[in-house]
């Protein structure tokens, strides 16, 4: 028996409105902000989550060297345009007609322009590097235990296929998780690495997107893994196009 229908809530997305008005009185949930129907058996797309977040009342809120083309989300929150599948539209514009191109995780990958700016395609982010620093512990975590637990976390909590967790690196106190997913590798029904990374980021910050009451409790052999700093780098299948002015700023 499954309880989700009884409660008519969305286990994977708390930023929804649910009611038993689906076919046969089934529970149907719609994302706040966009009103789009969401599949509560899997993660909601980052675009719909950002849109919901912007519509909600505002609350107070062996290590890898990232490539020269790696993007960091410095622009912060914005109210995105999502396509009918819930993906980011390649071109995003604000209320003052300033436009820019984004990648599949919604991070700006060009200089800002005006309404004449063209973004021919949504460029896929195929490599995500999650860089964490954990709080001091009595000793270092065992690398293989940490690796196994983080892989398990992404598989079980975020439903990300294990093949997309490319590596887990550890040099106390820095942990790096590499997610890789090319367009050709992603099958129908596969969770997108961008969505998994976003859910993980929000979990780590104590802002869980899941319906659960408590938030993430991550432990390695019973020892709590508490993160004090998170940095996420995004690498696209096509390098970003920024002017030299920005690169030297």
């Amino acid at each position: 028996h499954t309880a989700a229908q009884d409660n008519c809530t969305c286990p994977t997305n708390k930023m929804t409105v649910c009611s038993p008005d689906g076919p046969g009185g089934r529970c149907q949930c719609r994302a706040l902000g966009s009103g789009m129907a969401v599949d509560c058996s899997t993660l909601t797309s980052k675009c719909l989550l950002l849109k919901a977040r912007m519509s909600a009342p505002k609350n107070a809120r062996t290590l890898v060297r990232p490539s020269e083309h790696a993007l960091v989300d410095n622009d912060g929150l914005y109210d995105p345009d999502c396509d009918p599948e819930g993906r980011f539209k390649a071109r995003q514009c604000n209320q003052t007609s300033v436009c820019w191109c984004v990648n599949s995780v919604g991070v700006r990958r060009t200089d800002k322009g005006d309404l004449s700016l063209r973004c021919d395609e949504l460029v896929r982010t195929h490599h995500i590097l999650i860089d964490l620093r954990h709080r001091p512990t009595a000793g270092a975590f065992n690398h293989s235990d940490l690796d196994a637990e983080l892989r398990r976390l992404f598989r079980e909590r975020y439903r990300l296929h294990p093949k997309f967790v490319a590596a887990v690196h550890y040099e106390q106190p820095t942990i790096q998780i590499e997610l890789r997913q090319n367009t050709s590798q992603k099958a129908a029904g596969d969770v997108d690495i961008g969505d998994a990374a976003y859910y993980f980021e929000r979990d780590i910050k104590g802002e869980s997107l899941f319906q659960g009451r408590g938030g993430l409790d991550l432990r390695v052999r019973g020892e709590p893994l508490q993160v004090e700093r998170t940095l996420i780098y995004y690498l696209d299948e096509i390098p970003p196009k920024f002017s030299m002015k920005r690169l030297t700023a």
Epitope: A3, R157, F210, G212, R213, G214, G215
Partner: nanobody, 126 residues
Framework: QVQLLESGGGLVQPGGSLRLSCAAS????????MGWLRQAPGKERELVAS????????YYADSVKGRFTISRDNSKNTLYLQMNSLRAEDTAVYYC???????????????????WGQGTLVTVSS
């Protein structure tokens, strides 16, 4: 989806003890919060006791505090409920339940459970 199979129910006299067991299969048991629910005839299903995935957090309904103990053995994929000082009002079908979301902190609430077993009947009578 997780499969849950309860055992250990039966007829017991008031003041007696029983130990319920729940064997889990089909999904990784060890990272999910678990609980025992019960339903007496003509009454709503209620949460008796729950335990977080790590075992660091437990909850007991006021009516069973000090008498019932929930525990889990992740190496055996098994959940237990030790019931002591049983009373007639403990008579019910007892269900083992698994939380919908892994790696959650705190003990699960009734609404957090996504699946449960077929139940085992506990009858307390002289």
């Amino acid at each position: 989806q997780v499969q849950l199979l309860e055992s250990g129910g039966g007829l017991v006299q008031p003041g007696g003890s029983l130990r319920l067991s729940c064997a889990a299969s089909g999904r990784s048991f060890s990272r999910y919060g678990m609980g025992w629910l019960r339903q007496a005839p003509g009454k709503e299903r209620e949460l008796v006791a729950s335990i977080s995935w790590s075992g660091h957090s437990t909850y007991y309904a006021d009516s069973v505090k000090g008498r019932f103990t929930i525990s889990r053995d992740n190496s055996k994929n098994t959940l237990y409920l030790q019931m002591n000082s049983l009373r007639a009002e403990d008579t019910a079908v007892y269900y083992c339940a698994a939380e919908s979301l892994p790696y959650e902190s705190g003990s699960p609430r009734l609404t957090d459970f996504a699946s449960w077993g077929q139940g085992t009947l506990v009858t307390v009578s002289s």
